[in-house]
């Protein structure tokens, strides 16, 4: 019962990360205009990973996708990597654990079959977890980085008289989204794990016992059937092929390559 | 098309109050903040605030602060525009403003404070 | 706030001429996020609310005519009329639309010579 419990738990957890690492993913909001210096803008500013948007007076906001690809940063590109992988393992793994789930009988699945597809869930959870999260942190940096370099040479004077200030981005709610669904994802993982331990039947060692026929003799060893443990033996290689993983490249050209934190 | 149907002028006294209406028509009244603008004779024009249709979030000029209020009825597509403790140097025309690039203008609305 | 400045209060020309007006913010109006300048020019003709002509310091309102052209950027903005017309003899009016409070320039009157 235990086993099943921490099994469904994991997967509800692990459904909810992933459906938040996909939140985050698509979200505009992974840097927004720092409001420190000019907390009364009518023009603000946020980014995502896809595209950027500017919020103007009359409310109306206007978003532009990266036009280019080769243009952005590494760093970017890098991020956008690891939040795919990690939408692509965690949807894989939720496809396995949901066959993998005790409460679900398909066909005559041994528990051994469920306690090796429930560890691969989970290890898939896990990396996948830690994708997206290496990726908002990645990000997360990025921007402190940048936050101080701009903070550096906030203001440039323009023949001592006017002065133009620098947009500084923070922290967007979309990185806040990153790092819980993320930490979901992992623990949901951990939870999987933790129930595969369970599931994998104990080996059962009885001793032999001899039942002599009058006739001639016939040995019958209870136990005989003994599950297989080895995580490895049951899963077969499959190929994945993920075609859906591009990106929305629309609109217009992005400014500048350095602009986008 | 788009368009801001402000309410009729106003005569006020000293230290009264004057609401303005606006009645937004030809587009999605929620789409766009609505900001109001006013004109003394012979003056430059001065933004008073704006206010969100979607949420009723508002932002003053610092200059109108606790005597400005602006609200919405999105039911009725109409924001109205409040101004408390009137003096003589309130008598201005009076504007609504929306849609992008603030390029609808009510056709204004003459207040004036008089004893 | 943003102080806007326009130069010359007032502007005699006669029709067929060309006629450039300026306008200074004390502060850059310039947007890094999309690259755009956050000025915008009205005409005000008297008795009537103001009409939107340039936004963006350069992009014309459609349906404005050809020969209204804006320019310019950070703090330092320009209003050309390329050849004048009767209809174009009014006040003209620069406007912050970068940061609260909105701020609009004491305006340019533009007469007939």
């Known amino acids: 019962m235990a086993v099943t419990a921490c099994q469904g738990l994991g997967f509800v957890v692990s459904l909810i990360g992933i459906a938040g690492i996909i939140a985050a993913t698509c979200m505009d909001q992974w840097s927004t205009q720092d409001l420190y210096n000019n907390p009364v803008t009518a023009v603000f500013n946020y980014q995502g990973l896809w595209r950027s948007c500017v919020r103007e007076s009359s409310g109306f906001t206007e978003c532009r996708g990266y036009f280019t690809l080769l243009g952005l940063p590494a760093m970017l590109q890098a991020v956008r990597a690891l939040m795919i992988v990690g939408i692509v393992l965690g949807a894989i793994g939720l496809l396995v654990s949901i066959f993998a789930l005790k409460c679900i009988r398909i066909g005559s699945m041994e528990d051994s079959a469920k306690a090796n597809m429930t560890l691969t869930s989970g290890i898939m959870f896990i990396v996948s977890g830690l994708c997206a999260i290496a990726g908002v942190s990645v990000f997360a940096n990025m921007l402190v980085t940048n936050f101080w370099m701009s903070t550096a040479n906030m203001y440039t004077g323009m023949g001592g008289m006017v002065q133009t200030v620098q947009t500084r981005y923070t922290f967007g709610a979309a990185l806040f989204v990153g790092w819980v669904a993320g930490g979901l994802t992992l623990i949901g993982g951990v939870m999987m794990c933790i129930a595969c331990r369970g599931l994998a039947p104990e080996e059962t060692n009885y001793k032999a016992v001899s039942y002599h026929a009058s006739g001639h003799s016939v040995a019958y060893k209870p136990g005989g059937f003994k599950a297989s443990t080895g995580f490895g033996s049951n899963t077969k290689n499959k190929k994945i092929y993920d075609g859906g993983a591009r990106t929305e490249d629309e609109v217009q050209s992005y400014p500048s390559k350095h602009d986008y934190v | 098309q788009v368009q801001l149907v402000q309410s009729g002028a106003e005569v006020k006294k000293p230290g009264a109050s004057v609401k303005v209406s606006c009645k937004a028509s030809?587009?999605?009244?929620?789409?766009?903040?609505m900001h109001w603008v006013r004109q003394a004779p012979g003056q430059r024009l001065e933004w008073m605030g704006y206010i969100n249709p979607n949420n009723g979030g508002t932002s003053y000029n610092q200059k109108f602060q606790g005597r400005v209020t602006i609200t919405v009825d999105t039911s009725a597509s109409t924001a109205y525009m409040e101004l408390s403790s009137l003096r003589s140097e309130d008598t201005a025309v009076y504007y609504c403003v929306t849609t992008r690039y603030l390029a609808v203008w009510g056709q204004g609305t003459t207040v004036t404070v008089s004893s | 706030d943003i102080q806007m400045t326009q130069s010359p209060s007032s502007l005699s020309a006669s029709v067929g001429d060309r006629v450039t007006m300026t306008c200074k913010s004390s502060?850059?109006?310039?947007?890094?996020?999309?690259?755009?300048?956050?000025l915008t020019w009205y005409q005000q003709k008297p008795g009537k609310a103001p009409k939107l002509l340039i936004y963006w310091a350069s992009t014309r309102e459609s349906g404005v005519p050809s020969r209204f052209s804006g320019s310019g950027s950070g703090t330092d903005f320009t209003l050309t009329i390329s050849s004048l017309q009767p209809e174009d003899f009014a006040t003209y009016y620069c406007?912050?639309?970068?940061?609260?409070?909105?701020?609009f320039g004491g305006g340019t009157k533009l007469e007939i010579k």
């Open positions: 030809g587009y999605t009244f929620t789409d766009y903040n």
């Open positions: 406007q912050n639309d970068y940061s609260y409070p909105l701020t």
């Open positions: 502060q850059s109006l310039f947007n890094s996020g999309n690259q755009k300048n956050y």
